[in-house]
Interface confidence: low
């Protein structure tokens, strides 16, 4: 309705003399701030004067201040959303109505609050779930409809008079919806629980009392069960009478049936509260309980193991491990069915007693292969020996011993022979199943453990095998001393260490990585013909002449090699100029003559010049010099001068004519 | 009539040796475990060790243990107490008790009978 | 090792039940006997088992067992149930006996 304030807050509120109440309140005025409020204590409305009567516990002036007179309430509220009120100390007079008289600039309201406030502090209640089952927890809840921020109070737990040691979760509520304090107890009760007192005890601050309240605990259980056994040590030999006897100490709600288990398994026809057993045999030992039932289910008594004594049975072997790896260690446990248990053991090992063993276990802290075989044992009680049974095999496996790689060749070997290598061991267990090379190659196995390289290589040094079962044995590598030529055989320059110039002392070396065996023999060859057979090969004055391809050569017992060919390159300046004329050196006015400077150079000439017979040098720089048209003043005596990086070379002088032409004879 | 006879009680000085004996007369000796029980002058039992009828199992307290060796011989329907390295706290009255069972490991059942004790002095 | 645990000292008037206790893990897996020694004398095994009397024994004395503790009753004690009683039981290794409680008959 738009016509109404809206408040919300607690509908009662509950509290005792000399406490206190704390009122969480929010509103929303019809239209404005609040301007004024006023709290009455059961207001009435008065028609004659259009105003409430009634005590005023508390009055707002309009600029908010509070008369200094209204300490008990406080107003915690605001101008628009809040309306929270605090009464501290509460009386008992202060019970019924509060009015909250709200008025904006336009608008009045009066929302009114109930105030519960007793004499004494009421009690707190205790909530328990519909059904209490044992060993099912529950949560216990205690609920006290007070909180107030001005007085603390806690809630204890207590069973039978005393504090209960699980840890309770307390909580509380001040809120507009709800105002409560809580104490939860997760609890797992017991069947002795049943019919036990539960406070919940409400103390104030210092632990003084104040309330409390009290229920008695309904747990539903199973019945509980005493067995009491003749003879109570329910020991007896095959032939004795045993009686047991089943009384039910709790049982809520009452029991319905009865009956007797061996083993976990029910004994037919045994619906009664007593178990008579006649002339028992070995068969009936085992653990006895009786069962009583109720609605909620099975309670069982606890187990009393009747031991009916007979002499061991026949033996057996359990190893354990077979089969048993050399070197572990293997347990042999020797069974054998008997009451009482057997005193002492004699162990056999296939069929001879194992002397000094007479324990129900038989430990070997280090399996070597001759502990292999059968092994059988006997049990002995105070009633008897038994008989030895079949016994058990131990498998003792171990790697392949002895294991060594023969190579099957006749020595020396080549590079690119076929090598042949077998496996060998001496024993094994398990066999074995496969064999493993290193190095690992594309090599060929023909059969197992022989291993076959073809065109072995130079650089095959070593092998090793392995022979394995669960295993691998390896052997100590063999050398295979591999024979092969001399290898990367090149020319390297050792002097000059630059270029090498004409007239240089030059030595060449010829270097090879390896050789298999290591004497080997050098030769030096240029062009086909043979220069030399040491290692080095020199040139004390280098010339031209000394330039090519050289090769060298070496070779041992196995075979020879040669390098790539080496050129061998001698720089020299311009050598052997001369001045070649075309079309001759004798040419008709008019024509074209062309000049060539021919030379001999390494490196090429980079760079000519021209000199006429005066030594004039001309401004030209190429290898040709063309004269065109030629003319008469162009006779003459001719040079050329080469250059290149190393230095300079001259031609001699070459003489050109150039002679008249008929028509310029017939001009003259 | 069951009996049980100790002997062997004697002045010691601390680190030598010493050996009890139990004669047994009036039952089956080979049938039962045997038990050393001692009682220090104005103090409690103390069990010491224990024996299967047929040796096979054997028990120390810790107090004796690597120290004292219990034997028997149901031929002679005697039990022995081998006590070496004797210390002033092994002074006591040594029972030798006669156990209801036949392995000193069985189910507890009690020692049934108790000979008079011979007298353990252990100083220098 | 286990460790039963006895009062040192208890007292009942003549013609009134007394109950001697014994504590110890070891009671939760085997029963207690007990045993009455007068000065200068060998200890008497009077209970054994759960609740078992050997020959000789009155029928005053009785045992009972519940968790880790063992009980010892004299229903209408006589003055020559004056002495020394001790429990023991077996433990992991061996047996293992009580401190001892000494009765006194007022």
């Known amino acids: 309705d738009s016509s109404k304030w809206v408040f919300e807050h607690p509908e009662t509120l509950y509290a005792w003399e000399g406490a206190c109440v704390w009122i969480p309140c929010t509103y929303r005025a019809l239209d404005g701030d609040l301007e004024s409020f006023i709290l009455f204590h059961n207001p009435e409305y008065n028609k004659n004067t259009s105003k409430f009567d009634g005590t005023r516990l508390y009055e707002s002036t309009k600029d908010g201040k509070v008369p200094s007179e209204q300490k008990r309430v406080q107003f915690l509220g605001d101008k628009n959303k809040n309306c929270t009120l605090s009464i501290h100390p509460v009386h008992l007079n202060d019970s019924g109505q509060l009015g909250l008289r709200m008025e904006s600039k336009t608008e009045k309201w009066m929302e009114r609050i109930h105030l519960n406030v007793s004499e004494r502090p009421f009690p707190p209640h205790i909530q328990l779930p519909p059904e209490i089952q044992e060993s099912q927890e529950v949560t216990l809840t205690c609920l006290l409809n007070f909180s107030c921020y001005g007085y603390p109070i806690q809630l204890q737990w207590l069973l039978e008079g005393v504090p209960m040691r699980q840890a309770a979760v307390t909580s509380t509520s001040l809120t507009i919806k709800s105002v409560f304090t809580r104490s939860e107890l997760k609890f797992s009760p017991q069947w002795s629980h049943h019919g036990k007192i539960v406070t919940c005890q409400l103390q104030d601050a210092d632990g003084k009392f104040l309330s409390n309240d009290t229920v008695q605990l309904n747990v539903k259980h199973t019945p509980k069960l005493e067995i009491k056994v003749t003879p109570s040590d329910a020991i007896v030999r095959e032939g004795d009478s045993v009686t047991m006897t089943c009384e039910v100490s709790s049982s809520n709600p009452e029991y319905t049936t009865v009956s007797w288990l061996k083993d976990g398994t029910s004994l037919k026809k045994q619906n009664t509260f007593t178990l008579n057993l006649r002339e028992v045999t070995k068969d009936q030992s085992g653990k006895y309980c009786c069962q009583v039932s109720n609605d909620v289910g099975p309670g069982r008594s606890e187990e009393v193991f009747l031991q009916v004594q007979y002499a061991p049975e026949p033996s057996t072997v359990q190893i354990l491990h077979s089969p048993a790896v050399e070197g572990s260690q293997v347990e042999f446990l020797c069974m054998s069915l008997a009451n009482p248990l057997p005193t002492n053991y004699t162990w056999y090992h296939n069929g001879k007693e194992m002397q000094g063993r007479t324990e129900e276990k038989v430990h070997i802290p280090k399996i070597l292969p001759w502990h292999a075989g059968t092994y059988s044992c006997v049990a002995e009680n105070i009633l008897g020996t038994g008989q030895r049974g079949p016994g058990a095999e131990l498998d003792v496996q171990y790697p392949p011993k002895k294991v060594t790689t023969v190579i099957q060749n006749p020595m020396p070997i080549r590079e690119g022979d076929t090598v042949t290598l077998s496996c060998n061991y001496n024993s094994s267990n398990p066999s074995v199943t496969r064999y493993e090379w290193k190095p690992h190659g594309a090599w060929e196995e023909p059969s197992l453990g022989v291993l076959k390289i073809q065109n072995v290589g130079w650089d095959n040094t070593t092998i090793a095998c392995a022979a394995c079962n669960s295993w691998c044995s390896w052997a100590s590598p063999v050398a295979l001393n591999v024979q092969y030529a001399p290898r990367d055989v090149r020319v390297r320059k050792i002097k000059p260490l630059s270029e090498i110039h004409s007239g240089n002392s030059v030595s060449l070396q010829c270097d090879f990585s390896s050789s298999h065996p290591k004497e080997v023999q050098f030769f030096w060859e240029k062009n086909g013909r043979l220069l030399g057979k040491e290692s080095q090969l020199n040139f004390d004055s280098i010339s031209p002449e000394d330039a090519g391809s050289y090769s060298c050569w070496v070779n041992n017992s196995i075979g020879q090699t040669a390098s790539k060919a080496w050129t061998l390159e001698v720089l020299y300046a311009p050598r052997r100029l001369r001045v070649s004329m075309s079309p001759g050196d004798q040419v008709m006015e008019g024509k074209s003559a062309t000049l060539t400077c021919e030379s001999d150079a390494n490196p090429p000439v980079s760079h000519y010049t021209w000199f006429d017979w005066n030594n004039q040098s001309l401004p030209y720089h190429s290898q040709k010099l063309r004269l065109e048209p030629v003319k008469v003043q162009h006779s003459g005596a001719y040079w050329c001068q080469g250059t290149n990086s190393v230095g300079k070379g001259r031609s001699p002088l070459s003489t050109l004519t150039v002679y008249y032409s008929p028509e310029t004879i017939g001009r003259r | 009539e069951v009996q049980l006879v100790e002997s062997g009680g004697g002045l010691v000085q601390p680190g030598r040796s010493l050996r009890l004996s139990c004669a047994a007369s009036?039952?089956?000796?080979?049938?039962?475990?045997m038990h050393w029980v001692r009682q220090a002058p104005g103090k409690g039992l103390e069990w010491v060790s224990g024996?299967?009828?047929?040796?096979?199992?054997?028990g120390y307290a810790d107090s004796v243990k690597g120290r004292f060796t219990i034997s028997r011989d149901n031929a002679k329907n005697s039990l022995y107490l081998q006590m070496n390295s004797l210390r002033a706290e092994d002074t006591a009255l040594y029972y030798c008790?006669?156990?209801?069972?036949?392995?000193?490991?069985?189910?507890?059942?009690?020692?049934?009978?108790w000979g008079q004790g011979t007298l353990v002095t252990v100083s220098s | 090792s286990s460790e039963l645990t006895q009062d040192p000292a208890v007292s009942v008037a003549l013609g009134q039940t007394v109950r001697i206790t014994c504590q110890g893990d070891s009671l939760r897996s085997y029963y207690a006997s007990w045993y009455q020694q007068k000065p200068g004398q060998a200890p008497v095994l009077v209970i054994y088992g759960k609740n078992n009397r050997p020959s000789g024994i009155p029928d005053r004395f009785s045992g009972s067992s519940s968790g880790n503790t063992a009980s010892l009753t004299i229903t209408g004690a006589q003055a020559e149930d004056e002495a020394d009683y001790y429990c023991n039981s077996r433990d992991s290794s061996g047996w293992v006996f009580g401190g001892g409680t000494k009765l006194t008959v007022l």
């Open positions: 024996i299967s009828w047929n040796s096979g199992s054997i």
């Open positions: 009036g039952f089956t000796f080979d049938d039962y475990a």
């Open positions: 008790a006669k156990d209801k069972g036949g392995g000193y490991y069985d189910f507890w059942s009690g020692s049934d009978y």
